[in-house]
Interface confidence: low
């Protein structure tokens, strides 16, 4: 066992003692969390589509409001949106956000104020006078305007419907277009008006498909679990060759999904980065944390992949088989 864990450590796989090492070869199902595990976990905004009246809510104003709202979010998508808005507006300063609420698996709501300063002072091309931009409605001259407070909702279809907004079929189709590519599409409503769609992509890790294929060829069932909607989840799963998908799973329900498989007599390995999945890592027969993950995940896991390489999941199972064979 010591030799096995030693060899693993030399290869960037930390196995916490003999028990997980002996368990690894019994694993019949590997459940991968999507964000940060199958994907890089560094989402980026791919598209901002304005849906409302551009004169009333021009792009810059939408970006200022959305960037401020999402700045209070700890969700990776929120971080990506805020980063994008800051870059596009050429500012590090945002407005004020109050009454912030985040509903896992749905979206956020809050009140945003003090964005006038951003719109007045954020970067603009030196050779393009502000007056030109005003004509286009892309930079309202709001320096002296009465500070406005915007009521903001950002999230999935369900979240906006729950808050009384109607989503037309063409907006839903635009979202579906992105979701079919494995992207996450979120909607933005300001003051009760649907005014934008943001498409966010998180690239799949290069080795993911090979890791999945190798596990399947070893007779291991591979499952994808995610809080994302079914279309996005299915698109990512298809890219990497996973057939079984648990989508729209709330963070608190990931443990239940692991238990569900265990109740069918399966030995389950859960692979995740610890964002929303630490309890599931602890519940699994073998919890595998990828090295870039959170401290909580590394604590909860039986195996830590220091190199953040999914092929090391395969390597740990191989190593377990070889070690157990030697012991016997």
């Amino acid at each position: 066992v010591m030799v096995g864990t030693g060899v693993a450590a030399q290869n960037g796989i930390l196995i916490k003692g003999g028990k997980p090492l002996e368990m690894a070869h019994k694993i019949k199902t590997v459940m991968f969390d999507k964000t940060g595990t199958i994907t890089h976990g560094v989402p980026r905004v791919m598209r901002v589509l304005l849906l409302g009246d551009v004169a009333t809510l021009p792009l810059r104003k939408v970006l200022a409001v959305v960037g401020t709202a999402e700045a209070s979010s700890e969700h990776p998508l929120g971080v990506a949106v805020t980063k994008y808005c800051k870059e596009e507006l050429g500012t590090e300063t945002l407005g004020y956000c109050t009454d912030f609420q985040a509903v896992p698996g749905c979206g956020i709501g809050c009140k945003v104020s003090n964005v006038e300063g951003i719109l007045a002072h954020s970067e603009r091309p030196l050779s393009a006078p502000a007056s030109h931009l005003n004509e286009a409605g892309s930079l309202p001259a709001e320096k002296d305007a009465v500070p406005q407070t915007f009521s903001v909702l950002i999230g999935n279809r369900e979240w906006l419907r729950r808050n009384g907004l109607t989503i037309s079929s063409d907006v839903s189709d635009a979202m579906t277009d992105h979701e079919m590519k494995g992207q996450t599409a979120i909607l933005v409503a300001i003051d009760g008006v649907l005014c934008g769609m943001i498409a966010i992509a998180d690239a799949v890790k290069q080795e993911a498909a090979l890791a999945v294929h190798t596990l399947q060829s070893m007779g291991v069932d591979v499952v994808l679990i995610t809080g994302d909607n079914r279309k996005t989840a299915r698109a990512i799963a298809t890219q990497v060759g996973i057939n079984k998908v648990f989508a729209e799973v709330l963070p608190s329900h990931k443990v239940a999904k692991v238990q569900e498989l265990q109740n069918k007599g399966k030995k389950v390995a859960m692979v995740g980065d610890g964002v929303n999945d630490s309890p599931a890592l602890a519940q699994a027969d073998m919890g595998v944390a990828i090295g870039t993950g959170t401290d909580v995940a590394i604590e909860a896991a039986d195996v830590v992949l220091i190199r953040n390489d999914l092929l090391d999941v395969v390597a740990s199972i191989h190593l377990s088989k070889r070690t157990v064979r030697r012991i016997r």
Epitope: M46, V48, L50, L59, L89, P125, A136, K181
Partner: antibody, heavy 117, light 111 residues
């Protein structure tokens, strides 16, 4: 009808400056990227830079401050300084969707810039 | 910075035949599929054929097919017509490209 049209291309002497303009119609610059691409005679397409919906601009590494992109409500200008014979090319502007990775779905017809003494 | 490398030019095809053009990206393109294909005829502007690696642009005949993911992409033209004689370019993202987001181009000669 949505379109882009380049103008301002002409013969310039080496070391000179020139501004070519991309005029758009039928859509709002506040929702799209505009990219500038050039094509030397018999050569491939070469990206120069991009102007974002908010007016932010990004350039290819060889530009080194010689070229500047700016925009108004309906035009995007490419100002070129310190021109050399190697800058002789047809200059195209093209539209990309609301992000930095959208495809270029609409192109202007191009304007020819000739740098020669 | 992303670099797109295309099949060396030119490629010959007979009318009614099939031609395949390859485009290799280093590193992989955004979201593994953020790649488009263009057709350009002499003296004309480029025309979008395929986006998202495999989605046919509006008005483009279904003879044109895009495939691939990550780093390897292919444009296949089946039932080649005389009108398909052109140079074909692949392209990736543009905002912070630093290097050229366009491939070097592949000339298709129809015999």
């Amino acid at each position: 009808c949505q379109s882009l049209e380049e103008s301002g291309g002409r013969l310039v002497t080496p070391g000179g400056s020139l501004t070519v303009t991309c005029t758009v119609s039928g859509f709002s610059l506040s929702s799209y990227w505009i990219i500038w691409v050039r094509q030397a005679p018999g050569e491939g397409l070469e990206w120069i830079g991009s102007s974002g919906p908010s007016g932010s601009a990004y350039y290819t590494s060889w530009v080194k401050g010689r070229f500047t992109i700016s925009k108004t409500s309906t035009t995007v200008d490419l100002k070129m300084t310190g021109l050399t014979t190697e800058d002789t090319a047809t200059y195209f502007c093209a539209r990309a969707g609301g992000s930095d990775y959208d495809w270029f779905d609409l192109w202007g017809q191009g304007t020819l810039v000739t740098v020669s003494s | 910075a992303q670099v797109l490398t295309q099949t060396p030019s030119p490629v010959s095809a007979a009318v009614g035949g099939t031609v395949t053009i390859n485009c290799q990206s280093s590193p992989s393109v955004a979201n593994n599929n953020w790649l488009s294909w263009f057709q350009q005829k002499p003296g004309q502007r480029p025309k979008l054929l395929i986006y998202g690696a495999s989605t046919l642009a509006s008005g483009v005949p279904s003879r044109f097919k895009g495939s691939g993911s990550g780093t390897q992409f292919t444009l296949t033209i089946s039932d080649v017509q005389c009108d398909d004689a052109a140079t074909y370019y692949c392209a990736g993202g543009h905002k912070t490209a630093e290097k050229n987001p366009f491939g070097g181009g592949t000339e298709v000669v129809v015999k």
